[in-house]
Interface confidence: low
C-alpha cells in the first residue's frame, strides 16, 4: 500500500459519486496511429488533438490526419478535419501555437513531391476557423512566432532560406539565403547565422552571425568565425573559433550584438561543447564539456555581465552520446536546482543547490526509506533523482521531476535511496519544502501531475497492462485515494492537464484494443466537486522558505533576501482556484561575503569566504587577461552575485587594481573584434 494510507488520513467522503458525475469519455473514430495534443491559449479550455496514421499501400504510404477540438478542457471533442480540407498534417512540425492568448494556430500540411512550396493552415480564433495558405517555399522548421508580435512569423526553408511573414503567414518574403539557424530576440529582432561556402556543416566555425531589427529591411553582421549561438535571458552568446587553432571560445553580448566581450571560460576543442543550462536576466549557468569522451564537464555560474564565471560544480553529467543532462530548475522555490554528477567510480549521484549554484550538496535521505544495495553504510545514504539521463537509458522512469511555480515548495520525482542512482525499479518521492526534505510518496513508477496550484496531486501507475484506476491526493501526497474511472481498462499513453497547474481537469489518454479494432480514447475528470469550497484565509499558513531555524535572523537568506509564503494547509480540502496568486513577503538581509563572488583575477581559498588575488594568471584566465576588454580588468576583487538584493552589512571595498599589468605572455595581443554593418 502507498505510504500514508493509515487511519490518520483526511479522507474525502463520497468522492466516487462526485468524480463519476464529472468523468467524461470520448472515443475517437480512428485507427490508433499517433496522437498529439496542444492547449490553445491560457484558461480558454481549448484543446486541439491531431491524430495521424499511415496506411501502407503497395507502392506508397498514404497518410491521413484528423483534427479534433474541445472548448471544455477535453470533456467533449468535435471533429473539425473538414476545416483543414481533410489534408494530411506533418506531425514533425507539431501544432505551432501562438504566444500568450493570441488564439493563433499554424498547422503545416504534407504536400506532393512536385509542388512549388509547402502549405499551411492558419487560425487566429482559437481554431474555430482555418485559412489555407500555399507557401512560396518548403519549410524546414516549424513556424516561429515573434514573442512580441504574434503576427510576425519566421521559418527556414529546405533550401536554407530565411522567410518572414508580417501578417500571420498570409504573405511571405525571403529576407536572406544560406541561413543555418535563426532565432527571435527581443523587440522583434532576428538573429541568424549564414554560411559562405557550400553548407552549414561544411562552414561550421566559419559562419557569420547577422542581425536584423526591421524584419529584413537592413542587416548587420555582428560576428564572424561563428560555430553556434544562443540566447539566454538578456544575454546573447556566440562560440567563436580561435585564430590560432581549432578551439573555440564563448563571447557574450548584452546589447544585441553591438559589442562583445570574451567570457572568462575555458576554450573547447572540436570534440567538446558548451551548453547554456539555464539563464535569466541576472545570470547564466554554463556547462563546459571536458576534453575526451568523458560524459561530464563543469558547471560555471556567471556574474551579472555574463563575463566572469565561478566554477560551480565539477564532474557534471552531460552525456556526449544523446546529449542528456539531468539539470533541472526547481521552479517551486527560488534558487533551487537539481542535477547529476558522475563520480570517480562511474556511478551517478544527485546534487542539489539552494543558492543558485553557490554550493551543492547531496539530497537528504527520506525519513520513511531504507538505504538500498548501492549504500556502503546502511544508515547513511542520500536520495538520488531519476531525470533525463535515466529516461534515455530506458530505466523504468516514465516521468522527469515535476515542480510548478504556483505550487510553492512542491517537487515530485522518481528516485532511489543509496549511494548512487540505482537501476532497480524506482519509487516516487515528494518534497514540500523545495528539496530540503523528502518523503516516499508512492511505491513504484508512476505518472503524476499537479492540479489547482498544488491542491490536488494525481498519479497513475506505470504498467504494461491495461489500467482503469487513477490515484489522487489532497494533502500534498501524504494520503492517497483511488478512483476507477472506467470499467474497461485501457492501454495508458499519457496524462494531460493544462500547463500552469491551475486547472482542476485531468485527461487520461490511451487506447482500447480488441481483435478487430483499436481506438484512441480519452477520459477527462473534473475534480471541482472534490474541492467543494473556495479556500479562505484560515486555510493558509505562513511558511518561511529556505528556513531551518526561525530564531536565526540570517536563516533563510538566499541571494540577499528571505521570503515568507502563504501556503495551503495540508488538511484543508478546498479550491485555490484559477485566479490563485502566490502570496509572498520578502525581507532584505544584511550583506555578508557570501553575497559576493570573486571577480576576475581573484579566488576563494578552501574554507575561506575572502577573495584573494591570484598570484599568477594561467590558462583561460591569462587568455581573458590578454583578449578581454580593458574595463573588465579593473576590479576590487568582489562583485555582487547576480540577483542578490542584500543591503548594508559587510561592504568588501578595497583598492582597485588594474590587472592588465599582470597580462604577460609571448602571444601578440590580437585586434579587437569589430562588427561590420551592411
Amino acid at each position: 500500500s502507498a505510504p500514508g494510507e493509515d487511519e490518520e488520513c483526511g479522507r474525502v467522503r463520497d468522492f466516487v459519486a462526485k468524480l463519476a458525475n464529472n468523468t467524461h469519455q470520448h472515443v475517437f473514430d480512428d485507427l490508433r496511429g499517433s496522437v498529439s495534443l496542444s492547449w490553445v491559449g491560457d484558461s480558454t479550455g481549448v484543446i486541439l488533438v491531431l491524430t495521424t496514421f499511415h496506411v501502407p499501400l503497395v507502392i506508397m504510404t498514404f497518410g491521413q490526419s484528423k483534427l479534433y477540438r474541445s472548448e471544455d478542457y477535453g470533456k467533449n471533442f468535435k471533429d473539425i478535419t473538414d476545416l483543414i480540407n481533410n489534408t494530411f498534417i506533418r506531425t514533425e512540425f507539431g501544432m505551432a501555437i501562438g504566444p500568450e492568448n493570441s488564439g493563433k494556430v499554424v498547422l503545416t500540411a504534407e504536400v506532393s513531391g512536385g509542388s512549388r512550396g509547402g502549405r499551411i493552415f492558419r487560425s487566429s480564433d482559437f481554431a474555430k476557423n482555418f485559412v489555407q495558405t500555399d507557401l512560396p517555399f518548403h519549410p524546414l522548421t516549424q513556424m516561429m512566432y515573434s514573442p512580441q508580435n504574434s503576427d510576425y512569423l519566421l521559418a527556414l526553408s529546405t533550401e536554407n532560406g530565411l522567410w518572414v511573414s508580417k501578417n500571420f503567414g498570409g504573405k511571405w518574403e525571403e529576407i536572406h539565403k544560406a541561413v543555418c539557424l535563426a532565432k527571435w530576440g527581443s523587440d522583434n529582432t532576428i538573429f541568424f547565422t549564414t554560411y559562405a561556402n557550400g553548407s552549414c556543416k561544411a562552414d561550421l566555425g566559419a559562419l557569420e552571425l547577422w542581425r536584423t531589427s526591421d524584419l529584413g529591411k537592413s542587416f548587420k553582421t555582428i560576428g564572424v568565425k561563428i560555430y553556434s549561438f544562443g540566447l539566454g535571458g538578456r544575454f546573447l552568446f556566440a562560440s567563436v573559433m580561435a585564430d590560432k587553432d581549432t578551439t573555440r571560445r564563448i563571447h557574450v553580448s548584452t546589447d544585441q550584438g553591438d559589442t562583445w566581450s570574451m567570457a572568462q571560460l575555458p576554450s573547447v576543442g572540436q570534440e567538446q561543447f558548451y551548453s547554456i543550462l539555464a539563464a535569466n536576466d541576472d545570470m547564466v549557468f554554463m556547462h563546459v564539456d571536458e576534453p575526451g569522451d568523458t560524459g561530464f564537464g563543469t558547471i560555471f555560474t556567471s556574474d551579472d555581465r555574463g563575463i566572469v564565471y565561478s566554477k560551480s560544480l565539477d564532474r557534471h553529467l552531460y552525456t556526449t552520446t544523446g546529449g542528456e543532462t539531468d539539470f533541472t530548475n526547481v521552479t517551486s522555490l527560488r534558487g533551487v536546482y537539481i542535477t547529476s554528477v558522475l563520480s570517480e567510480d562511474n556511478s551517478i549521484q544527485t546534487m542539489i543547490t539552494f543558492d543558485q549554484g553557490g554550493r551543492w550538496t547531496h539530497l537528504r535521505k527520506p525519513e520513511n526509506s531504507e538505504c538500498d544495495a548501492t549504500a556502503k553504510n546502511k544508515n547513511e545514504c542520500s536520495l538520488h533523482i531519476h531525470a533525463s539521463y535515466s529516461i534515455s537509458q530506458k530505466l523504468n522512469v516514465p516521468m522527469a521531476p515535476l515542480s510548478e511555480p504556483n505550487a510553492v515548495g512542491i517537487v515530485i520525482a522518481h528516485g532511489s535511496v543509496g549511494d548512487a542512482i540505482s537501476v532497480m525499479v524506482p519509487d516516487v518521492y515528494i518534497s514540500d519544502d523545495g528539496g530540503y526534505s523528502w518523503t516516499k510518496m508512492l511505491e513504484g513508477p508512476h505518472y503524476y501531475t499537479i492540479l489547482d496550484s498544488g491542491g490536488i496531486i494525481v498519479a497513475i501507475e506505470h504498467s504494461s497492462r491495461p489500467i482503469n484506476v487513477i490515484k489522487f491526493s489532497t494533502d500534498e501526497g501524504q494520503c492517497w485515494q483511488t478512483y476507477t474511472f472506467t470499467r474497461d481498462p485501457i492501454y495508458f499513453t499519457g496524462l494531460a492537464s493544462e500547463p500552469g497547474a491551475r486547472s482542476m481537469n485531468i485527461s487520461i489518454w490511451g487506447f482500447t484494443e480488441s481483435f478487430l479494432t483499436s481506438q484512441w480514447v480519452s477520459y477527462t475528470i473534473d475534480f471541482k466537486d472534490i474541492l467543494e469550497r473556495n479556500c479562505e484565509e484560515k486555510d493558509y499558513t505562513i511558511w518561511a522558505a529556505h528556513s531551518t531555524d526561525p530564531e536565526d535572523y540570517e536563516d533563510g537568506c538566499i541571494l540577499g533576501y528571505k521570503e515568507q509564503f502563504l501556503r495551503l494547509r495540508k488538511s484543508s480540502v478546498c479550491q485555490n482556484g484559477r485566479d490563485y496568486v502566490v502570496t509572498k513577503q520578502p525581507s532584505i538581509c544584511l550583506c555578508s561575503l557570501e553575497d559576493f563572488l570573486c571577480d576576475f583575477g581573484y579566488y576563494r581559498p578552501e574554507n575561506d569566504s575572502k577573495c584573494v588575488e591570484q598570484p599568477e594568471l594561467k590558462g583561460h584566465d591569462l587568455e581573458f587577461c590578454l583578449y578581454g576588454r580593458e574595463e573588465h580588468l579593473t576590479t576590487n576583487g568582489y562583485r555582487k552575485i547576480p540577483g542578490d538584493k542584500c543591503q548594508g552589512g559587510v561592504n568588501p571595498v578595497r583598492e582597485v587594481k588594474d590587472l592588465k599589468k599582470k597580462c604577460t605572455s609571448n602571444f601578440l595581443s590580437p585586434e579587437k573584434q569589430n562588427s561590420k554593418s551592411n
Epitope: D245, T246, Q270, E271, F273, D289, T320, T321, G323
Partner: antibody, heavy 129, light 107 residues
Framework: QVQLVQSGAEVKKPGASVKVSCKAS????????MSWVRQAPGQGLEWMGI????????SYAQKFQGRVTMTRDTSTSTVYMELSSLRSEDTAVYYC??????????????????????WGQGTTVTVSS | EIVMTQSPATLSVSPGERATLSCRAS??????LAWYQQKPGQAPRLLIY???TRATGIPARFSGSGSGTEFTLTISSLQSEDFAVYYC?????????FGGGTKVEIK
C-alpha cells in the same frame, strides 16, 4: 594550392630509426591537425597518430606508443614522424594527411568529421638487414 | 578500439552498373565517418566525409549514407576510373580506425 610534400624513400636496418618529414603549403599550417597513416605492401591503411601543430600535442595509436614521436616546426610548416626500433614488419608506405578533426576523442553526437582531405605523396620505408 | 568491417572484400561490377559497398562499426560512430578511394601507387583520396557529404570535386555518382554502426557507399554508375580500392574510416573514438577495404574490379 594546398599541398603536402614528403621526404624521399628510406632503407633502414632492423633496430634503427627513421624520421619522415611532411612540408605543408597553401594553407595556414596551424589551422589543421596532421595525421600519419601507413600502408604495408598489399595491406590496408593503418592510422598511427595525430599532432596538433599549434602546441605540438599528440595522440598515438596504442600499437605505436613508445616507438613513435611526432613533432612539428611551425617556422617551416613541417611535421615529422620518427619511428624507432624498426622491424621488418614496419616496411610500408608512410603518409601524412591533413586532418581537420580534434585530438582523437569523442564529442557530442552532433560533432562533425571532415575526413583527411589532403594527403602527402607517401614515403616508402624499407626495413631489411 | 572501434573495429571497422567492410564487405564484400572484392566486388566485380561492369562499367555503367551500380556498386554498393558496406561498412560496419563495432560500436556507434555517429556520423563521424569518411570514405576514401585509392588507386595502385597513389595516395588515398577523400570521397565522403560526415558519412554523407561529398568532398570537393567528387562527382555526384558517389554518395554516402548511414549513421551509427551501418554505412554504405554507393557508386550509381561505374566509370572506368572508379575501379580502385575503397576504405571507410571512423573518427568517433581514438584511435581512428580504417576498414579492411573493398576492391572494386571490372567484371
Amino acid at each position: 594550392q594546398v599541398q603536402l610534400v614528403q621526404s624521399g624513400a628510406e632503407v633502414k636496418k632492423p633496430g634503427a630509426s627513421v624520421k619522415v618529414s611532411c612540408k605543408a603549403s597553401g594553407y595556414t599550417f596551424t589551422s589543421r591537425y596532421m595525421s600519419w597513416v601507413r600502408q604495408a605492401p598489399g595491406q590496408g591503411l593503418e592510422w598511427m597518430g595525430i599532432i596538433n601543430p599549434v602546441g605540438g600535442s599528440t595522440s598515438y595509436a596504442q600499437k605505436f606508443q613508445g616507438r613513435v614521436t611526432m613533432t612539428r616546426d611551425t617556422s617551416t610548416s613541417t611535421v615529422y614522424m620518427e619511428l624507432s626500433s624498426l622491424r621488418s614488419e614496419d616496411t610500408a608506405v608512410y603518409y601524412c594527411a591533413r586532418d581537420p578533426s580534434g585530438i582523437a576523442a569523442a564529442g557530442p553526437a552532433s560533432r562533425y568529421y571532415y575526413g583527411m582531405d589532403v594527403w602527402g605523396q607517401g614515403t616508402t620505408v624499407t626495413v631489411s638487414s | 578500439e572501434i573495429v571497422m568491417t567492410q564487405s564484400p572484400a572484392t566486388l566485380s561490377v561492369s562499367p555503367g552498373e551500380r556498386a554498393t559497398l558496406s561498412c560496419r562499426a563495432s560500436q556507434s560512430v555517429s556520423s563521424n565517418l569518411a570514405w576514401y578511394q585509392q588507386k595502385p601507387g597513389q595516395a588515398p583520396r577523400l570521397l565522403i566525409y560526415g558519412a554523407s557529404t561529398r568532398a570537393t570535386g567528387i562527382p555526384a555518382r558517389f554518395s554516402g549514407s548511414g549513421s551509427g554502426t551501418e554505412f554504405t557507399l554507393t557508386i550509381s554508375s561505374l566509370q572506368s576510373e572508379d575501379f580502385a580500392v575503397y576504405y571507410c574510416q571512423q573518427a568517433r573514438l581514438g584511435p581512428w580506425t580504417f576498414g579492411g577495404g573493398t576492391k572494386v574490379e571490372i567484371k
